[in-house]
Structure formats: C-alpha cells, structure tokens
C-alpha cells in the first residue's frame, strides 16, 4: 500500500480552501500541528486542522447533507405538490359545474321553484366542497337537508299552489313528512350512497396527496445527528487535514456512512411503498359510483327524476299530508 | 323529459366527437400521476445510494479516501478501515428514527389503512346493484307498482369529459346569467386549469 503523501509543509492549500468556507477566520495553522485536541479527524501525524476547523467542517457537512437530501426529493415533491393543487382545483370546478347543471335543470323544468331551489342547491354544493376539503360534515345529513328544504317548496309551489298564506307554517311538518312519507321514493337514499362513496374516495385521495407532501417535507428538513455529522466530516473533509484536496471518498465507504446517517429515514421505505401501492389501488377503483365527476355531474338528472316521482304521486301525497300536517286530528272527526 | 344542460348548451356534433376522442379526463390524470409516483416507489431505500452518487465519490480514480487514509479503490480497507476505532455505526442505527420520522410513519400507517379500507373489494357487490339498478330491492314503500327501478344508463347523462368541458369554455353560472340567456360564458381560470393538466411533471 502506498504511504500517504506528506502534508503541505505550510498548510497553504488547506487555508485557501478553508477561506472559501469561512472567509476571514484565522483558524488554519500556518504549519502542520500535532492536533491532539482533534476529535473527528484523528491524525496519524502532523495535521493542518484545528478543533475550530473541525467544528466548522461538521456544520458544513450537515448542511451539505441537507441540501443533497432536498435536491434528491425536489422532483418528487414538485410532482405531488403540483398534482395536489391541480386535483383540488379540478374537483372544485366539477362541483361548480354540477351546481350549475342542477340550477339549469330547475330553471328550465321548474321555474316556479327558483330562486329558493338555487339557494338550497348552492348550500348543498358548498357543503360538498367543504367535505372534500376535509370538513366534518355528514354526507347523509347534506342530502337530507337538500331534500328536506326542497320538499316544502315543491309542495307549496307545484303540488298545492293555492295554499293560503295562513297554512305556510306547515313547512316544518313538510320537512318531517318528506322522510316519513318517503315522498321522493328511494332517490335520496340512492343519492346518499353515490355521493358519500364518491366524495369519501375523493377526500381521501386529496388527503393522501397532502400527506405525501408532508412526508417529503419532513424528510427534506431533517436535522442530522452529531454522530452523523462526525461521520460525514470524516468522509468529506478529514482528507483535507492531510493536504489531500483532490481525493474522493471510496464508494463503498460512502454507502456505509449514508446508511448510518439515514437509518431512520430509510425506515419510511416500507410504508412509502405501501402508500404508493394503496393509492394506486384507490385510483383504480375510482369509477362509476366511486368517481365524483361521474356522480356529481349526473346529480341534476337524479334530482329531476326524484321530483317527477313526487309529481306522479301528488294526489295521494296531498291527501296524506293534509291529515298529517293538520294541527289536530280531532278537527277531522268533529 | 327534462331539458338537460347538454341539450341546451352543447352542439351534438361536438358532443359526439368528444365522446370518441381520447380525452384527458380526471381519471386519466390520476392514472398518469400514479405511474409517475411508481417510479419513486424505491425513493427512500435508494436515498443513501442517490446521495453518494450526487456527492464527490471516487469512480475512476485508483485511490480513494476511507475516512482515515488513502487506499486503493478495490481494497478491503476501502469500506472498512474508516469505521475502525471510531464511534459505533451499529449504535447509530440502533437509536431508531427521530420523533418527527416516527410521527410521519404513524401518519403513513394511518392513511395506508384508510386507503386499503376504501379500496376493499368487499361490499362492492352491493354497490354494483345500487349502481346499476338504482335501489335496493324490497325497499319500495306501500305500493309495489310504484317501486322505481332507476333510470338505467340514462340516469347519468353527463360523461366525465372535463377537457371537453374546458374546451367548450363553458361555465353556466345560472346565478349570474341575465334572464334566460343561454350563452356560454368562458372563465379563463377554468380553461387554463385543464390545459395545464397535461403539463405537470
């Protein structure tokens, strides 16, 4: 094995390199010293490093490592951030289109129900948007609220337009009757099933993308331990102390050091793999009633069908509601 | 039969073309994202190697630094010597991940559990019936003859063609629309969003 070349007799080269790291500081010895105070770059002979230099090298090594890590994850981070933003915006546009389709359906088929219908439809789709973004709203409650709100308007405007103003305090009864008489048939249940399934999947898809960003951000900004800093210093900078400026670390040695430094980070690997594969499975299943685009853009049609169902049964419903929403049953038996 | 929004605003010829062309839908966008993500599936296990290959490492040189001395690149000492009589690498590994890493692992475990639950094929048989038939049978109220069978394929009349929506530059804002005007009202930000869908890397 060849003997190490003698260190630079004046430590000049080391000084000029170190000046780039720490301009203006006089920490580099003029000539090689024994270096008995060194803790990382333990010398086998005279050295051009001081304790202060060693500390600076450690700091620099850890900074280098952080930068390398950030550049390693830059492409992945950009991919997820950009897609999360694109999908969020796309979902909002779908919701907006779905709202407009539904409003157009009311405007063209049931003009007498507007503007109240617009208001209820608007509230429903606002809740849809909030749900997708993670708000703590129950989808069944959203759908129930839509139909509970619509029915009194349908009853008073379409089914019983001659109702005197004095009878308009029956709105609350009509809301209750809507569920108890199942006035819309099974359409609300159908919509609940489709909307809740598609929105749940959409919401978790966005949550997963946002968590992906959080994972990258976390590993991106890791602070490496002192031990790791010492290993990196020994690998990248201790050769300088011997005046070996152009020498590079051995490949195998670098891998061993990196594995040591990144032991914690590498533990994420198993869960990261599972994350991508689980996300793929979710995406593969996002069709038909699991596809919010498909479900929401078709809602106007299902709502229209549900109103037609009410109209078809209007005669029977009006009679039953006349009884149920009377203030007292006794009126009818006097 | 209802006027449907596409009957009002979308030229039938355009509609037919849009249906047969390969559109960039949200669904194809999602699949594209997954394909790109899959190329990063080994991201964390490959990190040590990635960082070594992106930092100065002896590749073509005969000699390299092993942490203590200059050695020949293929000698036993190239990987081993630098670790001798130093702090224990095994100890470093044994410390376990930092609290922030443990936390993020817990979050990953949780989302993976959720993702798996949502993707479970069990229960999809029921969904299939609901999807195709409209309703569970036997839940029809009093009059069996009034039991609805759902609207079949006609039920969802708007296919998921977001690019085609974008290209039509059409945003029917009934709230804003004056009177009964049936004009398409383009919204710049919406259009650009969908054209940008293709530019994400």
């Amino acid at each position: 094995q060849p003997p190490p070349p003698p260190p630079d007799a004046t430590c000049h080269q080391v000084r000029s390199f170190f000046q780039r790291l720490q301009p203006g500081l006089k920490w580099v010895p003029e000539t090689p010293v024994p270096g008995s105070d060194l803790q990382v770059c333990l010398p086998k002979g005279p050295t051009c490093c001081s304790r202060k230099m060693e500390e600076k090298y450690q700091l620099t090594a850890r900074l280098n490592m952080e930068q390398l890590l950030q550049s390693a994850s830059m492409e992945l981070k950009f991919l997820i951030i950009q897609n999360a933003a694109v999908f969020q915006e796309a979902f909002e546009i779908v919701v907006r289109h779905a709202k407009n389709y539904t409003n157009a359906m009311f405007k063209n088929n049931y003009p007498s129900l507007t503007p109240q219908a617009f208001e209820f439809v608007g509230e429903f789709f606002t809740d849809v948007s909030l749900y997708i973004l993670g708000s703590d709203i129950n989808v069944d409650d959203m759908v129930n609220e839509l139909f509970d709100s619509l029915f009194p308007v349908i009853y008073t405007q379409l089914m019983n337009p001659g109702l005197p103003d004095s009878a308009l305090d029956i709105n609350e009864c009509l809301r209750g009757a809507r569920r108890d008489l199942k006035v819309f048939g099974n359409f609300p249940k159908l919509i609940m099933t489709q909307v809740s399934k598609s929105l749940q999947v959409t919401r978790i898809f966005l949550q997963a993308l946002n968590l992906g960003i959080e994972v990258i951000n976390t590993t991106d900004h890791l602070k490496f331990s002192k031990d790791c800093g010492r290993m990196l210093t020994r690998m990248w900078y201790c050769s300088y102390c011997q005046g070996l400026m152009m020498v590079k670390p051995c490949g195998g040695y670098c891998n061993v050091v990196m594995q040591g430094c990144m032991a914690g980070v590498v533990e994420i690997d198993k869960y990261w793999r599972e994350y991508i594969l689980s996300l793929e499975e979710l995406v593969n299943g996002m069709y038909r009633i699991y596809d919010m685009e498909n479900v929401l853009l078709g809602l106007f049609s299902t709502i229209h069908d549900s109103i037609q169902y009410v109209q078809k049964n209007a005669g029977k419903l009006t009679t039953t509601i006349g009884k149920l929403c009377a203030h007292s049953q006794q009126r009818q038996y006097r | 039969s209802a006027y449907y929004p596409e009957d009002l605003f979308i030229d039938k010829k355009v509609l037919k073309v849009a249906h047969v062309e390969h559109e960039e839908t949200l669904s194809s966008r999602r699949r594209e994202l997954i394909q790109k993500l899959k190329s990063f599936i080994s991201f964390y296990s490959a990190l040590p190697g990635y960082i070594c290959s992106h930092s100065p490492v002896a590749e073509n040189d005969t000699l390299c630094w092993n942490g203590q001395e200059l050695v020949e690149r293929y000698s036993q000492k190239a990987a081993r010597n630098g670790m001798k009589n130093q702090f224990n690498l095994h100890e470093l590994k044994m410390k376990g991940p930092e609290p922030v890493v443990s936390q993020i692992i817990d979050k990953l475990k949780h989302i993976n559990q959720l993702l798996r639950t949502m993707s479970m094929p069990k229960g999809r048989v029921l969904d299939k019936n609901l999807d195709e038939e409209g309703f569970e049978s036997g839940d029809c109220g009093d009059d069996e003859d009034e039991c609805i069978g759902g609207s079949g394929d006609g039920m969802i009349k708007v296919k998921n063609q977001l690019r085609f929506l974008a290209e039509l530059a059409y945003d029917l804002d009934v709230d804003d629309a004056p009177g009964n005007s049936q004009q398409a009202t383009p919204k710049d930000n919406e259009i650009s969003t969908f054209h940008n869908l293709g530019n994400v890397h």
Partner: antibody, heavy 117, light 108 residues
Framework: QVQLKQSGAELVRPGASVKLSCKAS????????INWVKQRPGQGLEWIAR????????YYNEKFKGKATLTAEKSSSTAYMQFSSLTSEDSAVYFC??????????WGQGTSVTVSS | QIVLTQSPAIMSASLGERVTMTCTAS???????LHWYQQKPGSSPKLWIY???NLASGVPARFSGSGSGTSYSLTISSMEAEDAATYYC?????????FGGGTKLEIK
Amino acid sequence: QVQLKQSGAELVRPGASVKLSCKASGYTFTDYYINWVKQRPGQGLEWIARIYPGSGNTYYNEKFKGKATLTAEKSSSTAYMQFSSLTSEDSAVYFCACSTYYTMDYWGQGTSVTVSS
Amino acid sequence: QIVLTQSPAIMSASLGERVTMTCTASSGVSSSYLHWYQQKPGSSPKLWIYTTSNLASGVPARFSGSGSGTSYSLTISSMEAEDAATYYCHQYHRSPYTFGGGTKLEIK
C-alpha cells in the same frame, strides 16, 4: 271514532323483555304517528318514541335508545313497543297515543308493567 | 332538551273561581307545538288545548289558553267540580318531546 286499545297488564322479572301492543281503529293507521309515553306511579309523563307506520320510520328519545324498539304491523293496524333488560325503574304505565305532526290527539287506556322478582 | 316548568305544582280553587296556571319553557317553543292535557286518576291523558289556544273536541268554553315563546298559560274562567284534575303542558316541537311536571287542581 278513533280508538287505541292496548294489551293487558304485565308482571315481569328483572332482565327480561316485554312487548306491548296498541291496536288502532277508526282511522287510517298508516296516516298518523304512534307515540309511546311512560308514566311512573304518581309521576309525570315522559315521551319514549314515535313511529310512522306508513314507512316504519322511528324517532327515539335518546334516553330510551337501546331500551325501546318500536314496530308497526300495517295489516292488523297494530303498533308494538318492545322493552328490554327491564329493571325496577321500568315499572310504569305505558300509553300509546296517535298524533299528527303537531299533536297527540288520542290516547290508549295504558298498560301497566310491573318489574319484580 | 326543552324543560317545561309548571306552576303551581298543586293548587285549589273554589267553584266559580277564575283559575290560571302557567308553563315556562327553558327555550322558545313555537305556539303551534304547545299543548295542554288533562288527566284524572286511573285514566289516560286527554288532549285539552292544542296549539296554545285551540280547545279540543268536547272541552268546555270556560277553558282558554294563551302565550308565546317561553311563557304559556291555561285559564278556567269559572271553576267547576269536573275540572279537578292534573293538567300537563307539552311541547311537541323539539325532540325529545317533553311534558311539564303537571299542575294538580283541587276543589277548595
């Protein structure tokens, strides 16, 4: 005229269940709610739950969820209330009452339930 | 839940006397959902006054009801022997539907 006829008095052991019935006549059974109300000896009235026989929809007082179960049989115009895991606290007279959305108009004669070992 | 407080809990009145009993709700109740029931020992309750002021079938005209929001009352313009009973106010507005503790009216 409207009548609600309730089943006879019950003497039951603690931990057991009891099923009370309320047979309606004089009106269309499926058009009105049937409510159940509890009255302990010398005490006031406490609403338990209601059912709409037309659809089977039920609404419970949170306090009685898991304790009371309401059902209705359209063919016989009869409403039922099953009361489970009985304790001495459940000893009371139970009334059924039919109602519109607003008012409990007609009441059954009541069924006395005594829980005793 | 809405708590209904009736006062007085027990009262006695002479025949021909005007009687008023009150029912106070812990939060507002719509007048459409506030009712009064009469119950005599060993009998089931009977609807007496519905939606605050409407007399149920067969109830004598000497009875009247009034009120709004959280304060309601039942009045007998001239007490008669058959009026001795317990009267319950009841809100059928917000679940769980509740009854007042009752006002027991006795003959003096």
